[in-house]
């Protein structure tokens, strides 16, 4: 039960991960205007990875594209790559999963299978939000850089009359919901890894030990009785471990997965 | 088609206030006060997103003027204290535009600040 | 503060003249996000209420005759009239659309020659 609870947990955090990933790279709002002493400001600015905005104090928000691809600068194409390799990984992971989730049941695929399944999406998941807290530190490392260079920049070449404020750019809304998104996949990839564990069946656990059947806080234990000799293949033990799991598992653990979904 | 009507003001002494008002219909996201002296150029004087309520004000009229809109009446609102004679002139309600242009404004109402 | 200066305060011009107005800021009105000077150009007259012609500098009102035009980026902006009519004379004022707050310049009055 423990092991359905974590495995479904993990799916559901990393669902709403890579929903918060798919999210975070479709805003606009990865860098903002920075607007230090003037917290009121007529045209206020917002990039994001596929387009620039300007929002005017008159309500009117205009957005351009990026239509050039060679003309960008080489980290916001890394960004772009990062955070797309992340849903790539993600969306394909959470396809995995689904098949692997003990509570649904595929044709007779074996535990040992679904246990491959999950720790796979796992690892998916754990390599897709590393991806996108990559991807948004990389962002956020450029903006820290740039903010400094242009307040460096703000205060000189004023000797004349005529002053020119250069623009600067502090972090928005997305690079948070990037770093949130991408920890939850993460975690929940973790989860999926921890569950596959306890999924993977134990060729000689509980050979010639009925009793163990009922127990299924001992039975989903993973690593337990490793060192102990077999009796070969015990196709009856077997069918009653599983059995026994599988229906406890489908009358509790399925209305809290279509609750989820 | 956006219709802008100001009222409210009048004569009135040194020290002394006045709330002026402007009917608006039309879709209005945000709205702007802006001052004319007799024979004068145009002044700005306050701004209002008329969704929000977010505010500001030209430097020489912050603490005395208050910008101020009415939803379920759709008015917008100038309450101006402390009144000083050289803040005689005909106000306008404008309505702010693409460019944070000033595309529409009503007819102007004429304060009068004398002893 | 941004100051707008226009220039000249006024002038007299007879009609089919061409006419030009111009107007500086104290700070570009260049817009880097947009790439759009956000410079407002308006006509008043005589106890009437301004009435816009020209935004960003260059984009013309819908309603406002063809012969208006506006030039410009960041600090120097111009407004022509390419053939000057009976009912173009007035007082032009340019605004600074850029930053709060707003700020008009001083106004060019165009008289008849």
């Known amino acids: 039960m423990a092991v359905t609870a974590c495995q479904g947990l993990g799916f559901v955090v990393s669902l709403i991960g890579i929903a918060g990933i798919i999210a975070a790279t479709c805003m606009d709002q990865w860098s903002t205007q920075d607007l230090y002493n003037n917290p009121v400001t007529a045209v206020f600015n917002y990039q994001g990875l596929w387009r620039s905005c300007v929002r005017e104090s008159s309500g009117f928000t205009e957005c351009r594209g990026y239509f050039t691809l060679l003309g960008l600068p080489a980290m916001l194409q890394a960004v772009r790559a990062l955070m797309i390799v992340g849903i790539v990984l993600g969306a394909i992971g959470l396809l995995v999963s689904i098949f692997a989730l003990k509570c649904i049941r595929i044709g007779s695929m074996e535990d040992s299978a679904k246990a491959n399944m999950t720790l796979t999406s796992g690892i998916m998941f754990i390599v897709s939000g590393l991806c996108a807290i990559a991807g948004v530190s990389v962002f956020a490392n450029m903006l820290v850089t740039n903010f400094w260079m242009s307040t460096a920049n703000m205060y000189t070449g004023m000797g004349g009359m005529v002053q020119t404020v250069q623009t600067r750019y502090t972090f928005g809304a997305a690079l948070f919901v990037g770093w949130v998104a991408g920890g939850l996949t993460l975690i929940g990839g973790v989860m999926m890894c921890i569950a596959c564990r306890g999924l993977a069946p134990e060729e000689t656990n509980y050979k010639a030990v009925s009793y163990h059947a009922s127990g299924h806080s001992v039975a989903y234990k993973p690593g337990g009785f490793k060192a102990s000799t077999g009796f070969g293949s015990n196709t009856k033990n077997k069918k009653i471990y599983d059995g026994g799991a599988r229906t406890e598992d489908e009358v509790q653990s399925y209305p809290s997965k279509h609750d989820y979904v | 088609e956006v219709q802008l009507v100001e009222s409210g003001g009048g004569l009135v002494q040194p020290g002394g206030s006045l709330r002026l008002s402007c009917a608006v219909s039309?879709?209005?996201?945000?709205m702007n006060w802006v001052r004319q002296a007799p024979g004068k150029g145009l002044e700005w004087v306050a701004w209002?997103?008329?969704?929000?309520?977010?505010?500001t004000y030209a430097d020489d009229f912050k603490g005395r003027f208050t910008i101020s809109r009415d939803d379920s009446k759709n008015t917008l609102y100038l309450q101006m204290n402390s009144l000083r004679a050289e803040d005689t002139a005909v106000y306008y309600c404008?309505?702010?535009?693409?460019?944070?242009?000033?595309?529409?404004w009503g007819q102007g109402t004429l304060v009068t600040v004398s002893s | 503060d941004i100051q707008m200066t226009q220039s000249p305060s006024s002038l007299s011009a007879s009609v089919g003249d061409r006419v030009t107005i111009t107007c500086k800021s104290s700070?570009?009105?260049?817009?880097?996000?947009?790439?759009?000077?956000?410079l407002t150009w308006y006509q008043q007259k005589p106890g009437k209420a301004p009435k816009l012609l020209i935004y960003?500098?260059?984009t013309l009102r819908s309603g406002v005759p063809s012969r208006f035009s506006g030039s410009g980026s960041g600090t120097d902006y111009t407004l022509t009239i390419s053939s000057l009519q009976p009912e173009d004379f007035a007082t032009y004022y340019c605004?600074?659309?850029?930053?709060?707050?707003?700020?008009f310049g001083q106004g060019t009055k165009v008289e008849i020659k």
């Open positions: 960003w500098a260059s």
């Open positions: 209002i997103n008329m969704y929000t309520g977010e505010r």
């Open positions: 039309g879709y209005t996201f945000s």
């Open positions: 605004q600074n659309a850029y930053s709060f707050p707003f700020t």
């Open positions: 700070q570009s009105l260049l817009n880097s996000g947009n790439i759009k000077s956000y």
């Open positions: 404008a309505r702010l535009y693409n460019g944070n242009s000033l595309d529409y």
